[in-house]
């Protein structure tokens, strides 16, 4: 029914994650995760971050690891929320009410997000060579990333 996930794994907390290589807009990726019985993944601190990093490092995707890949995650800055340059997530937030770890214990930003308080913005996880997590990158929600991460 579904093309199988490129990689999947679970964390010590019992949550499971899947990584999919598919060129998609953010909305289509989020819908894909829901249709699979999950949701677009948060990548908070601690066990969750470790589980997702392990998925990425399990091997290169299409292209054999020759280029940086962008994966949709459940990170966005809502309209009317401002860029906060001194916050670890820069004013972005995870689309989940699950309790998370310390936001200070997160990946770095590959590029600083544009300063804005008006437009909704999404963010991707950039992986160098498709396997080594470089950090977060702001991305317009209607653009296509190389893949997405789901959480179950």
């Amino acid at each position: 029914e579904h093309p199988t996930a490129d990689r999947a794994g679970c964390s010590a907390s019992g949550a499971c994650y899947s990584l999919h290589h598919a060129t998609m807009k953010r909305q289509a990726a989020e819908e894909a995760c829901i249709l699979r019985g999950g949701a677009l993944s948060t990548v908070r601190a601690g066990a969750e971050l470790r589980a997702v990093l392990a998925l990425l490092r399990a091997g290169p995707g299409p292209g054999g690891g020759s280029k940086d890949l962008l994966f949709w995650v459940a990170l966005e800055r809502r309209r009317s929320h401002c860029t906060l340059e001194n916050e670890p997530l820069r004013g972005f937030s995870w689309l989940s009410s699950d309790p998370g770890g310390l936001e200070s214990d997160t990946l770095q930003w590959v590029e600083e997000p544009q300063r804005s308080c008006t437009a909704r913005r999404c963010a991707v996880l950039q992986a160098t060579g498709g396997v080594e997590p470089a950090g977060w990158k702001e991305m317009r929600c209607h653009l296509r990333a190389n893949g997405y991460l789901c959480k179950y």
Epitope: H2, A28, E31
Partner: antibody, heavy 117, light 108 residues
């Protein structure tokens, strides 16, 4: 303007199969999931499944697995649904529908294809 | 799957009357993924209210939506003749997407 144009009314015998179409225009067909919904006469709405034309990924309501098959042809921006082993329970109006701009609500619908078994 | 129960199944209201119908989910649904559709006989459903409280394009301001968790409602502040229709709630928080059985609103 976004439009979903569905094929016409179908009359079919029990046990037969039917294939209906939904031609999309006014948006990038390969970028959005296309959903199918069933409505029996005088009844409510049931989600059948969805297809992502960009890579032919599909998802089905468990109830319709083995009954419905979803496909898409990107060159013509057309989605198809085939229903097999028809019974009286399959007599209904079938809608193709997709999200385009409001949080995952189905905000564009075809006019419906009526199937009578 | 998440079951959505709408009540009442059928209701009638006089012109100018305030109308409220409810949608109860069998388990919690994010307000972002709870929507309402209006359908009239012989027509396709139309998105009416999305994400619990946002009116779709062209929907009169007399309509409103509210709720959270397992309890949602659609309200018409002052019934008009064109509001006679069947209204369906719909969730997309969990797959499969599900719809309520509908509330048929008639003019008294």
């Amino acid at each position: 303007e976004v439009q979903l144009q569905q094929s016409g009314t179908v009359l079919a015998r029990p046990g037969a199969s039917v294939k209906m179409s939904c031609k999309a225009s006014g948006y990038t067909f390969t970028s959005y999931w296309m959903h199918w919904v069933k409505q029996r006469p005088g009844q409510g709405l049931e989600w059948i499944g969805a297809i992502y034309p960009g890579n032919s990924d599909t998802s089905y309501n468990q109830k319709f697995k083995g009954k419905a098959k979803l496909t898409a042809v990107t060159s013509t921006s057309t989605a198809y649904m085939e229903l097999s082993s028809l019974t009286n329970e399959d007599s209904a109006v079938f809608y193709c529908t997709h999200y385009y701009g409001s949080d995952y609500a189905m905000d564009y619908w075809g006019q419906g294809t009526s199937v009578t078994v | 799957q998440i079951v959505l129960t709408q009540s009442p199944a059928i209701m009638s209201a006089s012109l100018g009357e305030r109308v409220t119908m409810t949608c109860t989910a069998s388990s919690s649904v994010s307000s972002s993924y709870l929507h309402w559709y209006q359908q009239k006989p012989g027509s396709s459903p139309k998105l009416w209210i999305y994400s619990t409280s946002n009116l779709a394009s062209g929907v009169p301001a007399r309509f409103s939506g509210s709720g959270s968790g397992t309890s949602y409602s659609l309200t018409i502040s002052s019934m008009e003749a064109e509001d006679a229709a069947t209204y369906y709630c719909h969730q997309y928080h969990r797959s499969p997407r599900t719809f309520g059985g509908g509330t048929k609103l008639e003019i008294k």
